[in-house]
């Protein structure tokens, strides 16, 4: 039959070349004379001339050494002609499989892996995979399968086995426990690839493991006892720097510390945060202290981390004794503001009051006080007793230094420490109004027609308060009455003033006397301008001149 | 001589607790990894439970998840397992073992725990 | 049932070898070096006899030798003695949580 089996050839053969592989033969071959030849790749047709085939006889041979990791299978067709040239068979189907040989090593992807595991880990715990590539073949033989294991590892600390690698996947994995980034923070491994599954060529690289940190170490302090001392009263005060020490990753969150105030600030007194760069605890006042009240204050300080711990760790814990120093303080006046009814327009020398400071210092310093500020010079005050008096005539009714009936006074107390210090009180004194005002008319110039007068409304103001204002009262006075009448609205807050017989043009005083509810009189004189006109007039017009 | 020494076992109720202790000497305990191993009457040998030698990774069989706790002090030199809602099933010998190298070696002589109401 | 699967009994005489096999897969047995054996009297704790496939620890008997092939480990006791009638437990390492494998037992008996 016209048919070939697949014909085996081993790579890298040694020959002689040209090899007789198999023959080619057609049972056409009785009837005439047959010509074999061959194409495809590998015969006619790149890589030519690797195969060729004696014409006559039909040998199929090769040229030269196979090599399978270059091409491991060739698919040639087998022809044969008459002497004619005239095809006797189809093209025959021969195929050529290069068999392998274990002509390669294993090579790892990487000269060096790189990988991670967190310390303190179990065995059974992935680390990293190894990955090696062998071309030679793996399906059909164990030339290209390779087998990968541990050479060494260093540091042998704790222990000389502990990691270990599967010997097919290449995954490395722990196998035993005692990783401890504090003591070793790496491990070189050399690894090794072996075809043969095990027992063929080997090729090494190396692969490191870096252990990552885990919190395993809590922060102590270093020194456990502080002494410190602050001046009274300072707020934002730095008090002391204490200083841990961590072994575990600079600048992780499992090394940056966490300060707690533990006891001993029982009124809130101080704060502490973290130094972001040297991770001391900053304490720091919130408040002010007092000596007086308490003159040394005795802190606990507990230092965690951000990140929490990964196992049960005893908490270091830190003592702090503040000492707080006395300070001279400044006179403190008790109200701070005080607020004093007094009556207007007392008499000069008259007391007002007395403002008085206390000293929170313990020794009994002399305070002395003066006015600091006095717009209107009012007041005066005695600086051993801190009796204020009146030295001028306190008027409620003063707009430019009275508002809402309150003078401010600003009144200072210093004590005769060293250096002296001054504190400072404000006096308001609320002005008890007096009937010193009289009701005034508004406008005070009216005009008026001599004929159907309008009659004038006059708005009654008077400075005082209620109840010395409205309802007002009104008269005439000098003999205004004459020629005038006033009278006072309902509401008591307006005087109508009418003309009430004819006067010739020209401007007349009314005499206008005006009392409020109190029967403080007051009087006022009314420019009249009386025109010639009837009804309402703004201006007298001029003299009417006829053509 | 590496020694350990088990105790805490006895007769409890299903539902129960029961703390176990290992006591180790002779070895740098918070070096090695621990594990309890359980023998169950007539049956063979069963791990229940591992942890690191800091404490800070720990392992358990399915069949105990959740229920059991594993724990050491190491100032102590001492394995802990915690037992709670205790089943009949659980009823065995338990060892304490030194896990390292992929081998438990050495061994304690054993506590039994008896669940049985 | 156990990870590893051992043979429930074997026997042999005074005098004679046997073997003891321990199979697993791939990714226990066929993966690792790690194998190890134990033997437990009645009454007893567990005591290692062979580690890392092969290696004995000081104190145990040279007639006790392993071997490995593929995904099945082997413990051979040669020279058998009446001491040697006990419970055979073989153990692998395997990576994840549950790192260590347990092989069910095999009664040896000394006839």
């Known amino acids: 039959d016209w048919v070939v089996a697949p014909i085996s050839v081993p790579e890298n053969g040694k020959g002689p070349f040209p090899q007789r592989l198999n023959q080619l033969k057609s049972n056409k071959d009785r009837d005439t004379k047959i010509f074999y030849s061959i194409t495809g790749p590998g015969a006619d047709s790149p890589p030519e001339g690797v195969f060729a085939v004696e014409k006559e006889t039909g040998w199929l041979l090769l040229n030269k050494p196979l090599d399978r990791e270059e091409i491991a299978k060739y698919e040639l067709f087998g022809h044969a002609v008459s002497e004619n040239g005239a095809s006797v068979e189809d093209p025959m189907n021969i195929s050529i499989i290069v068999t392998d040989q274990n002509d390669h090593k294993p090579k790892f992807t990487q000269d060096t892996f790189r990988g991670s595991v967190l310390e303190g880990v179990l065995p059974g715990t992935s680390v990293m995979q190894v990955t090696a590539t062998d071309e030679d073949d793996a399906i059909y033989t164990y030339n290209g399968v390779v087998a990968y294991s541990i050479h060494s590892q260093e540091p042998k600390d704790p222990h000389d086995l502990m990691f270990t690698i599967h010997r097919s996947t290449g995954t490395i994995s722990v196998i035993s426990s005692g990783l401890d980034r504090e003591k070793v923070p790496e491990y070189t491994l050399t690894i090794q690839a072996t075809d043969m599954d095990g027992d063929g060529s080997t090729t090494t690289a190396v692969a490191v493991v870096e252990i990552l940190d885990a919190n395993d170490n809590a922060p102590m302090f270093d020194p456990q006892k502080y002494e410190a001392h602050v001046p009274e009263n300072a707020v934002g005060h730095e008090v002391q720097r204490l200083t841990v020490t961590d072994l575990d990753a600079p600048n992780s969150p499992a090394w940056r510390a966490t300060y707690l105030i533990m006891g001993g600030d029982d009124g809130d007194h101080f704060t502490i945060t973290t130094h972001p760069e040297s991770n001391q605890g900053i304490l720091t006042t919130r408040k002010g202290l007092d000596f007086e009240a308490k003159n040394q204050h005795t802190l606990y300080v507990e230092v965690t981390n951000e990140a929490p711990f990964v196992l049960k760790l005893p908490t270091s814990t830190a003592t702090i004794v503040v000492h707080v120093e006395d300070v001279n303080e400044a006179p403190v006046f008790v109200p701070p503001s005080k607020v004093v009814e007094v009556q207007e327009g007392i008499p000069t020398g008259e007391p007002v009051c007395v403002y008085t400071a206390e000293d929170p210092d313990k020794e009994n310093q002399k305070i002395s006080y003066r006015i600091l500020r006095d717009p209107a010079g009012w007041l005066a005050m005695d600086p051993d007793s801190g009796q204020v008096t009146a030295v001028g005539t306190l008027d409620r009714e003063d707009e430019q230094f009275v508002r809402n009936n309150i003078y401010e006074v600003m009144v200072l107390a210093m004590d005769n420490g060293s250096p002296p210090t001054t504190g400072t009180g404000t006096l308001l004194l609320t002005l008890i109004d007096v009937n010193d005002h009289g009701p005034v008319p508004e406008p005070r110039q009216i005009t008026i027609c001599n004929q159907s007068p309008v009659r004038q409304v006059l708005n009654i103001t008077d400075k005082d308060l209620s109840p010395h204002t409205s309802p007002f009262q009104a008269q005439l006075t000098d003999d205004s009455d004459i020629y005038w009448t006033a009278e006072v609205n309902e509401e008591g807050d307006t005087v109508v003033l009418s003309l009430k017989k004819f006067l010739k043009q020209d401007t007349y005083d009314v005499h206008l006397s005006l009392s409020d509810h109190g029967n403080k009189e007051q009087l006022t004189v009314i420019r009249a301008t009386v025109c010639d006109c009837h009804g309402h007039v703004e201006t007298c017009p001029g003299p009417w001149k006829g053509g | 001589e590496v020694q350990l020494l088990e105790s805490g076992g006895g007769l409890v109720q299903p539902g129960g607790s029961l703390r176990l202790s290992c006591a180790a000497s002779?070895?740098?305990?918070?070096?090695?990894?621990m594990s309890w191993v359980r023998q169950a009457p007539g049956k063979g040998l069963e791990w229940v439970s591992a942890?690191?030698?800091?404490?800070?990774?720990?392992y358990y069989a399915d069949s105990v998840k959740g229920r059991f706790t594993i724990s050491r002090d190491n100032s102590k030199n001492t394995l802990y397992l915690q037992m709670n809602s205790l089943r009949a099933e659980d009823t065995a010998v338990y060892y304490c073992?030194?896990?390292?190298?992929?081998?438990?070696?050495?061994w304690g002589q054993g506590t039994m725990v008896t669940v049985s109401s | 049932q156990s990870a590893l699967t051992q043979p429930a009994s074997v026997s042999g005489s005074p005098g004679q070898s046997i073997t003891i096999s321990c199979t697993g897969t791939s990714n226990d047995v066929g993966a690792y070096n790690y194998v190890s054996w134990y033997q437990q009297h009645p009454g007893k704790a567990p005591k290692l006899i062979l580690s890392?496939?092969?290696k004995r620890p000081s104190g145990v008997s040279n007639r006790f030798s392993g071997s490995k092939s593929g995904n099945t480990a082997s413990l051979s006791i040669s020279g058998l003695q009446a001491e040697d009638e006990a419970d055979y437990y073989c153990?692998?390492?395997?990576?994840?949580?549950?790192?260590?494998?347990f092989g069910g037992g095999t009664k040896l008996t000394v006839l």
């Open positions: 073992a030194d896990t390292n190298s992929a081998k438990f070696d050495p």
């Open positions: 002779g070895f740098t305990f918070s070096s090695y990894a």
């Open positions: 942890i690191s030698g800091s404490g800070g990774s720990t």
């Open positions: 153990t692998s390492y395997t990576m994840g949580s549950t790192f260590m494998l």
């Open positions: 890392e496939v092969n």
